[in-house]
Interface confidence: low
Amino acid sequence: GELETSDVVTVVLGQDAKLPCFYRGDSGEQVGQVAWARVDAGEGAQELALLHSKYGLHVSPAYEGRVEQPPPPRNPLDGSVLLRNAVQADEGEYECRVSTFPAGSFQARLRLRVLVHHHHHH
């Protein structure tokens, strides 16, 4: 199997950002859990959330109320999360790490860009 994600996710300031992470597995493979972290170089990594196949979503205190699962229906191989109300400080690199059975662990990175729309008066 392999992880499918986007190299770059672009959202407008204030929008919800979908951080995609989908495990394209062979028949019978399962995703046990998905861990999301922010991994900007030089900043150290910061936990976002842990998505467990049995126990659901646990959000790190730093992101309480800001990380959710996409609305149903949900594919059990989909480890994507929503980052609510994106701000400029959210711009950076994110990593999902996926634990699968029986194939082992996989990881993928993406960059989140947050666009600020300036209003020009004529």
Partner: antibody, heavy 127, light 107 residues
């Protein structure tokens, strides 16, 4: 560095219960899975069950189902293992062990690898 | 339950020797395998996780390999402090199970 400190040795009568505690310090208690592993004198290691504090749900080995209860108190960063209906063959050293779901640097470990261990609690069952 | 079978159960070796311990799972466990070292009266210590990843602080003379059902722990040059009992453990499914242990003793 995570430290796990267990309660002291116990001597119990057959048929009674024992409750062993395991207090964690130096890490984020909610981020790891706590398991209990026992070792009878001169024998190997045997997993009894575990709990994930952030989810509050315990998972037990079938062998101990109905006789063991594992709980965790997030407010005090303490895990507990209670074993009932004790018999002589339960005489063993009982260890708590912690494995991260994700560690403080965000680098993910498959849970139930035991990065950290308590010092062990000897439980002797004797009439 | 997944059975973990270690061999040999006892191994006599000298300082400087290359030592290999094997662990076989009764069914495929991908790379969900750890190795521990235990000394008398002490708690086990994690050496290797995910079959081949060296735990932080563990000397590089320890290495792990394998996937599926067959796994190996190698000590490239045995040191005096390495005389101990070694256990493998699978974390593929619960109940988590350990091998019976391999005692590495002085020849």
């Amino acid at each position: 560095e995570v430290q796990l400190v267990q309660s002291g040795a116990e001597v119990k009568k057959p048929g009674s219960s024992v409750k062993v505690s395991c207090k964690a310090s130096g890490g984020t208690f909610s981020s790891y899975a706590i398991s209990w592993v026992r070792q009878a004198p001169g024998q190997g290691l045997e997993w009894m069950g575990g709990i994930i504090p952030i989810f509050g749900t315990a998972n037990y080995a079938q062998k101990f189902q109905g006789r063991v209860t594992i709980t965790a108190d997030k407010s005090t960063s303490t895990a507990y293992m209670e074993l009932s209906s004790l018999r002589s063959e339960d005489t063993a050293v009982y260890y708590c062990a912690a494995g991260y779901y994700y560690d403080s640097s965000g680098y993910y470990h498959q849970p139930y690898y035991f990065d950290y261990w308590g010092q062990g609690t000897l439980v002797t069952v004797s009439s | 339950d997944i059975q973990m079978t270690q061999s040999p159960s006892t191994l006599s070796a000298s300082v400087g020797d290359r030592v290999t311990i094997t662990c076989r799972a009764s069914q495929g466990i991908s790379n969900y395998l750890a190795w521990y070292q235990q000394k008398p009266g002490k708690a086990p210590k994690l050496l290797i996780y995910a079959a081949s990843s060296l735990q932080s602080g563990v000397p590089s003379r320890f290495s792990g390999s394998g996937s599926g059902t067959d796994f190996t722990l190698t000590i490239s040059s045995l040191q005096p402090e390495d005389f101990a009992t070694y256990y493998c453990q699978q974390s593929y499914s619960t109940p988590l199970t350990f091998g019976g242990g391999t005692k590495v003793e002085i020849k």
